[in-house]
Interface confidence: low
């Protein structure tokens, strides 16, 4: 498996998608795990619903959520309020019995927010927001491993 890089900005959210063959993995639950070391085990972070037919329901473990489109064949993981310690290697897995097939190897990169007010002189002022509520992000930037990218201007 090649490694796919997903980049997010610190404090924001990152959506990771793992496509798979829906027929080959029919009836299988999925999981998102974090690779511990180069050859270490992959530690489970969150898995889809215990009932495969309900895999479309979002399941959450802390700031990480998972949902599975079993018909379309896309596993989606959302990492909210991304922090530097979230950076690292992960896997999307398809579970069968005590075994797990790797659907995709993922490298999560966490980029400092270049629009941080400390870097922008007097640019930033308190904004006006008329309501503050939680929501799920639906955005990420995915490229090949060789392309390091920063999704916001640095205002250096």
């Amino acid at each position: 498996h090649n490694t796919t890089v997903f980049q997010g900005v610190e404090g924001q959210s990152l959506q990771v998608s793992c496509p798979y063959d829906s027929m080959k993995h029919w009836g299988r639950r999925k999981a998102w795990c974090r690779q511990l070391g180069e050859k270490g085990p992959c530690q489970r972070v969150v898995s889809t619903h215990n009932l495969w037919l309900l895999s479309f329901l979002r399941r959450r473990n802390g700031s990480t959520a998972i949902t599975d489109d079993t018909l379309g064949g896309t596993l989606t993981i959302t990492l909210r309020n991304l922090q530097p310690h979230d950076a690292g290697f992960y896997q999307c897995q398809s579970l069968h019995g005590s075994e797990a097939d790797t659907l995709r190897k993922v490298l999560v990169e966490v980029l400092a927010d270049p629009l941080d007010h400390r870097d922008a002189g007097d640019l930033w002022v308190p904004g006006e927001s008329e309501s503050f509520e939680d929501a799920h992000v639906e955005h990420s930037i995915s490229r090949s491993l060789l392309e390091g990218e920063i999704p916001f201007p640095p205002t250096s």
Epitope: G11, S13, N81, D116, W124, G127, V137, H139, P153
Partner: antibody, heavy 118, light 112 residues
Framework: EVQLVESGGGLVQPGGSLRLSCAAS????????MSWVRQAPGKGLEWVSV??????????GYNPSVKGRFTISRDNSKNTLYLQMNSLRAEDTAVYYC?????????WGQGTLVTVSS | DIVMTQTPLSLPVTPGEPASISCQSS???????????LNWYLQKPGQSPQLLIY???TRASGVPDRFSGSGSGTDFTLKISRVEAEDVGVYYC?????????FGQGTKVEIK
């Protein structure tokens, strides 16, 4: 599908005020920076203002040409971005676009025309 | 403010032929990260602008591969390998390095 729809433009006298709205859909509004960009008739594009996302406390930034006169805000319960424009001048006459800001202005609304004239 | 200067301001093109637009910035847009904060937009007649290229050379989602961006810290080029009728409109470069963000004055591409 991401959609941005502006409204609120119109004719206003110099020194007057106007409030523009931008209704957003198709993405999680609170997670994105949003911006206003304007285009005077027959002219080029000028960035006006930006408001950051929830993770950045919705802090705002302005082009010096409008700072102190314009205020950007957002109502996250309505997925709506606003631009309150005060002390309007003839040179503020333009089509005002609302745009989502990621690694560029990746989605734009259709624009709303603001005409400042006596 | 960083000043963006585009040339030419008008570009008559022939469908099927290549076309090239230049953009120059008054300051290097190359950041210490190695990224160059230069974007290209196309505004088709009667439409809103659309993002074509970001970080100088990365095509935005859905943009045909006949569009390519290149350049150095201050000199940039947008190339269309084979112009199609739907490519007409005004092309803008924009620096994304510093506030306030600034755009070039635009290059109007039209069919000969």
């Amino acid at each position: 599908e991401v959609q941005l729809v502006e409204s609120g433009g119109g004719l206003v006298q110099p020194g007057g005020s106007l409030r523009l709205s931008c209704a957003a859909s198709g993405f999680t509004f609170t997670d994105f920076y949003m911006s206003w960009v304007r285009q005077a008739p027959g002219k080029g594009l000028e960035w006006v203002s930006v408001i950051r996302n929830k993770a950045n406390a919705y802090t705002a930034g302005y082009n010096p040409s409008v700072k102190g006169r314009f205020t950007i805000s957002r109502d996250n319960s309505k997925n709506t971005l606003y631009l309150q424009m005060n002390s309007l001048r003839a040179e503020d006459t333009a089509v005002y676009y609302c745009a989502r800001l990621t690694y560029g202005f990746d989605y734009w609304g259709q624009g709303t025309l603001v005409t400042v004239s006596s | 403010d960083i000043v963006m200067t585009q040339t030419p301001l008008s570009l008559p093109v022939t469908p099927g032929e290549p076309a090239s637009i230049s953009c120059q910035s008054s300051k290097s847009l190359l950041h210490s990260t190695g990224k160059t904060y230069l974007n290209w937009y196309l505004q088709k007649p009667g439409q809103s602008p659309q993002l074509l290229i970001y970080w100088m050379s990365t095509r935005a989602s859905g943009v045909p591969d006949r569009f390519s961006g290149s350049g150095s810290g201050t000199d940039f080029t947008l190339k269309i390998s084979r112009v199609e009728a739907e490519d007409v409109g005004v092309y803008y470069c924009q620096q994304f390095l510093e506030y306030p963000f600034t755009f070039g004055q635009g290059t109007k591409v039209e069919i000969k």
